[in-house]
């Protein structure tokens, strides 16, 4: 399955005092996602 999650830099979306627009990109930068093969705790979401 193709991973529908994009890999944009969440840091670009966060500004001090404007954290309302922050993006949760932790899954894309998780240990699990870094593992290229085998079962992962963060499978791609469909």
């Amino acid at each position: 399955l193709a991973d529908p999650l994009d890999h944009r830099d969440a840091g670009d979306l966060w500004f001090p005092g404007e954290s309302e627009s922050f993006e949760d990109a932790h899954v894309e930068h998780s240990i699990s996602r870094s593992l290229l093969e085998g079962e992962i705790p963060f499978p791609p979401t469909s």
Partner: antibody
Framework: EVQLVESGGGLVQPGGSLKLSCATS????????MHWVRQASGKGLEWIAH??????????YYAESVKGRFTISRDDSKTTIYLQMNSLKTEDTAVYYC?????WGQGTTVTVSS | DTVMTQSPLSLPVTPGEPASISCRSS???????????LYWYLQKPGQSPQLLIY???NLASGVPDRFSGSGSGTDFTLKISRVEAEDVGVYYC?????????FGPGTKVEIK
Amino acid sequence: EVQLVESGGGLVQPGGSLKLSCATSGFPFSNVWMHWVRQASGKGLEWIAHIKAKSDNYATYYAESVKGRFTISRDDSKTTIYLQMNSLKTEDTAVYYCTGLDYWGQGTTVTVSS
Amino acid sequence: DTVMTQSPLSLPVTPGEPASISCRSSKSLLGVRDITSLYWYLQKPGQSPQLLIYRMSNLASGVPDRFSGSGSGTDFTLKISRVEAEDVGVYYCAQFLRYPYTFGPGTKVEIK
């Protein structure tokens, strides 16, 4: 097998310093965002620091309770993250975990007492 | 700060019966890309926390499907369809959308 192994904890007097390490293995480290979370005895979890990847200019973020006293860093060549803790207070006494939010280490205990 | 609250704080359960834990955030956890940044962890006695649910409703790998997560922008629920003895421990909700990241106070689940 993914492993996160913390070390460097111990007994230190108030005002003292400690440097914690978290050696990782079993996964490509360089693009992973890492965190330190602590837990005082019998209490809940408290997030304290976060470091992003080289592609994010190693951006760092801290909880107010440790800002200006603690510094998170990483060495991608050693696949290790660190937490330099200065001006330690008795309320910093806790088990310190390194985590990618999915995997967690076993923790290292820091005790600040005179 | 985004304050996370949980209820109940203590939950006696009967094996084989369902159980439910509620979590509320003081601000919406719905971020861009319609992703809700609500995570659930279980910390078993003497162990490190383990991930159960990420982004409100996604089951982490290796987690039994008797666990499920649901909710809206500020109100969330973790359900266990049939509690087993190994499910005892402290359950925490957490948000990783806004700094500082915050955890709920925890719900202690114990067998009656």
